[in-house]
Interface confidence: low
């Protein structure tokens, strides 16, 4: 109560008083998260001709400033606007890769299938990827000791409002056929309160995406079931074509195979079903 | 509670030097070091700063050009290959309160690097 | 970069007068500023930070006040032993940013 005593007398929210750090329930900053994301700009801009003229300290500034110095719980998308801006990118038509609760495969898909791409194979998803931040109020300081968590914490903080600011973009400018890769080994094969499921869907525009086509991956190697059949890919079938886009599911029985079919699709094996 | 700089010494250009600054009465778990210096009847420079997690920030001119390192008790500051520019006393200082603050209230005597050929 | 910006180089005050110094931030630093004063062949020692703080035991004749671009430090009823240079500094502890001082402004207390 001696604590609250000093908070009446002086009227100063809790949050403004730096000797008191926030200890929120999620991990703490990215050690060298800085130095990560500025490293990262560098090597994406290396390697992606189109994003040369990218200046990496800029986008680091506008990353900065999306977070520093504010509450970690009142973060909005547009406090990632300039961000957006310096990290615009358009991916060809059917090209764009969606994934929900399958990340590592999709990742590997698109490591091998160079011409797709996944948000994380994008500058700003790039940056991100794997990645924890958050700042305190009124400091420049980034608290590498704990973050919000979005269950326990708050859901408007640093990190998700970034991951839903980019997810929304990337829906936005998606065009032609969208793929979608879906865990079919989880009991909610498409959740309706995934990233996927309450971002993307909902951005995908009709008058330029002419079709979803979702690639449920199945886990187990004897399971010949026929996922698209799931009551919650319906769902997904049903929210898509409410919105004029047309709906396409395709098992993948065995992801090992459909892997390695990319790699090799003359492989006489990649002839039969996967 | 003090802190205090040590190595500094004449040096000819391009032969890497490394400061020590040792603390006594607080702990590196608790609090970051900062590195200033400053050259001859010049004004104060930021070099750099460590986190008690062993994390490194730098002046934009001072990376590559110094590496900050940590021990239990003391933290380094190594400049990797010294010009005539980096003549200069370096003061190594630990912040008010927490961890990752630049405001020094706890400073060092310094310590005088001079680099001539 | 950030760059801090502080005039004058130099003020002559008789005692008993008063001293304003300047710091211009070339972008928003919030509060995160601080003031130290540094005597010849000693160290910076920290007067004021969190733009407006008083660090411990220093007198209350020194007086900072500002916050976003436009910081002041203010010392009153001069005395002999406030002849120093004085120098203001940004905190903002977050990768690559230039130096975080000013260039320093000497007070000559006549």
């Known amino acids: 109560s001696g604590l609250n005593d000093i908070f009446e007398a002086q009227k100063i929210e809790w949050h403004e008083l730096p000797r008191w750090r926030q200890q929120w329930s999620g991990s703490g900053t990215t050690s060298r998260f800085p130095e990560t994301v500025l490293a990262r700009c560098v090597k994406y801009t290396e390697v992606h001709p189109e994003m040369r003229h990218v200046d990496c300290q800029s986008v680091w500034d506008a990353f900065k400033g999306a977070f520093i110095s504010k509450y970690p719980c009142n973060i909005t998308e547009e406090d990632y606007q300039p961000l957006v801006k310096l990290g615009t990118q358009t991916v060809p038509c059917n090209k764009t890769l969606l994934w929900s609760r399958i990340k590592d495969l999709a990742h590997q898909f698109t490591q091998v299938q160079r011409d797709m791409f996944t948000l994380e194979d994008m500058l700003l998803g790039y940056l991100a990827d794997d990645l924890t931040w958050c700042g305190e109020f009124n400091t420049f300081e980034i608290n590498y000791q704990s973050c919000p968590d979005w269950r326990k914490d708050c859901s408007n903080n640093p990190v998700s409002v970034f991951w839903k600011t980019v997810s929304r973009r990337f829906a936005e400018t998606a065009c032609g056929v969208v793929h979608v890769m879906l865990n079919g080994s989880r009991s909610k094969i498409f959740d309706k309160n995934s990233t996927f499921g309450s971002v993307e869907v909902h951005n995908l525009q009709p008058e330029k995406v002419q079709a979803l086509e979702a690639w449920v991956i199945h886990g187990g190697r004897e399971d010949s079931r026929d996922l698209c059949q799931d009551p919650t890919i319906k769902e997904l079938e049903s929210i898509i074509s409410k919105r004029n886009i047309r709906f396409f599911c395709k098992n993948i029985y065995r992801p090992d195979k459909f892997l390695q079919c990319v790699k090799n699709p003359e492989d006489s094996s990649c002839l039969s079903g996967i | 509670q003090s802190v205090e700089e040590s190595g500094g010494r004449l040096v000819t250009p391009g032969t890497p030097l490394t400061l020590t600054c040792t603390v006594s009465g607080f702990s590196l778990s608790n609090y970051g070091v900062s590195w200033v210096r400053q050259a001859p009847g010049k004004g104060l420079e930021w070099i750099g700063y460590?986190?008690?997690?062993?994390g490194t920030y730098y002046a934009n001119w001072a990376q590559g050009r110094f590496t900050i390192s940590k021990t239990s008790t003391t933290v380094d500051l190594k400049i990797t290959s010294p010009t005539t520019e980096d003549t200069a006393t370096y003061f190594c200082g630990r912040p008010k309160d927490s961890d990752s603050s630049a405001f020094v209230s706890l400073w060092g005597p310094g310590t005088l690097v001079t680099v001539s050929s | 970069d950030v760059v801090m910006t502080q005039t004058p180089a130099s003020v002559s005050e008789p005692v008993g007068g008063t001293v304003t110094i300047n710091c211009q931030a070339s972008?928003?630093?919030?509060?995160?500023l601080a003031w130290y004063q540094q005597k010849p062949g000693q160290p910076p020692k920290l007067l004021i930070y969190?733009?407006?703080t008083l660090a411990s035991g220093v007198s209350s004749r020194f007086k900072g006040s500002g916050s976003g671009t436009e910081f002041t430090l203010t010392i009153s009823d001069l005395e002999s032993a406030d002849a120093a240079t004085y120098y203001c500094?940004?905190?903002?502890?977050?990768?690559?940013?230039?130096?975080?001082f000013g260039g320093g402004t000497e007070v000559v207390v006549k």
């Open positions: 500094q940004a905190n903002h502890m977050i990768v690559i940013y230039g130096n975080g």
């Open positions: 460590i986190l008690t997690s062993g």
């Open positions: 972008e928003s630093i919030y509060s995160n």
């Open positions: 969190k733009a407006s």
